[in-house]
């Protein structure tokens, strides 16, 4: 029989018959090592490769460029997949992005983008998006016209300030923009009036820090 092809992403995993959410190993084009990722097989038809997850504040997201480049955390809990991996995956084929959010009152919402990819490291992992829909606000809380990735040691934003230092975490800051899902985790009761929290402006406003977030991608032709 034909030799089995390695999984490029969680869509391949799903289409191979593995339809339970969990950790799987994928083989990304141009990456020397396989990568363990969390695959969400439940939301909106499944096949989603999780690139970011926040849920309990157990992981420090205030990290430098190199760590955001290669990723940190554990796919079984809180983690950032790594910009180099996100770039490599989204260079394989066309992807959509879905962001699942939950506030401290238990309200859930999502934002979805028909097209998502990021540039390479030389391009500061610049964000490219098209076609926003969802329940987490009529307007997009991610910069649609493109923004470079910034960290505490790499200031690539459009502000006279240093957004990543001020708002914490690495993100596609503008000046500083309407979102930051890699900000400080604040617990219930402490999550209001926070400049540097986990923010999705058009869902909960400029200074509400969210309880949980998941960023996940899936091929357009899934």
């Amino acid at each position: 029989r034909e030799e089995e092809k390695p999984f490029r992403d969680c869509a391949d995993v799903y289409q191979a018959g593995f339809n339970k959410s969990g950790i799987y190993t994928i083989y990304i084009n141009n990456m020397p090592e396989p990568k363990k990722v969390f695959c969400n097989m439940d939301v909106n038809g499944g096949g989603w490769t999780v690139i970011q997850h926040r849920e309990d504040g157990s992981l420090d997201f205030q990290r430098g460029w190199k760590e955001y480049k290669m990723g940190f955390g554990n796919p079984s809990g809180e983690y950032w997949l790594g910009n180099e991996f996100i770039f490599a995956i989204t260079s394989q084929r066309q992807y959509m992005l879905r962001i699942e959010l939950m506030d401290w009152e238990g309200n859930r919402a999502y934002s979805q983008y028909d097209r998502f990819h990021i540039g390479n490291e030389k391009q500061n992992y610049r964000l490219y998006l098209k076609g926003h829909t969802g329940t987490a606000g009529k307007q997009s809380s991610l910069i649609l016209h493109g923004a470079d990735f910034s960290t505490k040691d790499a200031d690539n934003d459009n502000c006279m300030c240093k957004c990543a230092l001020m708002l914490t975490g690495g993100w596609w800051f503008d000046a500083c923009g309407p979102s930051n899902l890699n900000g400080m985790f604040y617990t219930a009761g402490q999550n209001h009036g926070k400049l540097n929290g986990i923010k999705w402006h058009y869902f909960k406003g400029p200074s509400y820090s969210l309880r949980s977030t998941t960023m996940m991608i899936r091929p357009l032709d899934f």
Epitope: N158, M160, C161, L195, N196, H201
Partner: antibody, heavy 122, light 112 residues
Framework: EVQLVQSGGGVVQPGRSLRLSCAAS????????MHWVRQAPGKGLEWVSY????????YYADSVKGRFTISRDNAKNSLYLQMNSLRAEDTAVYYC???????????????WGQGTLVTVSS | DIVMTQSPLSLPVTPGEPASISCRSS???????????LDWYLQKPGQSPQLLIY???NRASGVPDRFSGSGSGTDFTLKISRVEAEDVGVYYC?????????FGQGTKLEIK
């Protein structure tokens, strides 16, 4: 390049009106809160008024409340200050100023206009 | 309204020497989110003010590293490690923690 170009100043009699304008360019105007700050001749700076990015939130200093009206036209990238019932003590250079951060996060003024002189005198 | 008090009001400095300006507020400027909304602005002769330091200690882009801000609560300081001729002008502190924003009366830095 961020630019705030002001116009509309001049000499006006007490009790009369004047409208100041501030034309913005080089940034997404509709994403930023905007302010008016004034400086009486030889004096320090005094905050006058604030309008949020969408125009839904507005604040005034007590000294101008009920007389001045701040407004914005995001389609025209413009900020305005309508000044009615002007008094001698309103004589000052008026500056428009942009929030440092977008989306109505307050951290001070990142950019200032060149200023326009309003003289209230009979 | 919060009263901001600067000292000294006049500061003659020899080029190359350090300079320090104090700013005190009538109430604490430490916001519940952990930030001190205290900015420093420089108004050079005949010009509009320009931002030097935001949120107490963060230098704005393009501001030389000889400028530094420090302090928390009610006491803040702007330091210039080595004054240059281009630093002349009036320095203002401004608080934005409590509405309305209020400015200090200004400190005039001049070259000896």
């Amino acid at each position: 390049e961020v630019q705030l170009v002001q116009s509309g100043g001049g000499v006006v009699q007490p009790g009369r009106s004047l409208r100041l304008s501030c034309a913005a360019s080089g940034f997404t105007f509709s994403s930023y809160g905007m302010h008016w700050v004034r400086q009486a001749p030889g004096k320090g700076l005094e905050w006058v008024s604030y309008i949020s990015s969408s125009g839904s939130t507005i604040y005034y200093a007590d000294s101008v409340k009920g007389r001045f009206t701040i407004s914005r036209d995001n389609a025209k990238n413009s900020l305005y200050l309508q000044m009615n019932s002007l008094r001698a003590e309103d004589t000052a250079v008026y500056y428009c100023a942009r929030d440092l951060l977008d989306y109505d996060i307050w951290t001070g003024y990142g950019y200032w206009g060149q200023g326009t002189l309003v003289t209230v005198s009979s | 309204d919060i009263v901001m008090t600067q000292s000294p009001l006049s500061l003659p400095v020899t080029p190359g020497e350090p300079a320090s300006i104090s700013c005190r507020s009538s109430q604490s400027l430490l916001h519940s989110n952990g930030y001190n909304y205290l900015d420093w602005y420089l108004q050079k002769p005949g010009q509009s003010p320009q931002l030097l330091i935001y949120a107490g200690s963060n230098r704005a882009s393009g501001v030389p590293d000889r400028f530094s801000g420090s302090g928390s609560g009610t006491d803040f300081t702007l330091k210039i490690s080595r004054v240059e001729a281009e630093d002349v002008g009036v320095y203002y502190c401004m608080q934005g923690t409590h509405w309305p924003p209020t400015f200090g009366q200004g400190t005039k830095l001049e070259i000896k």
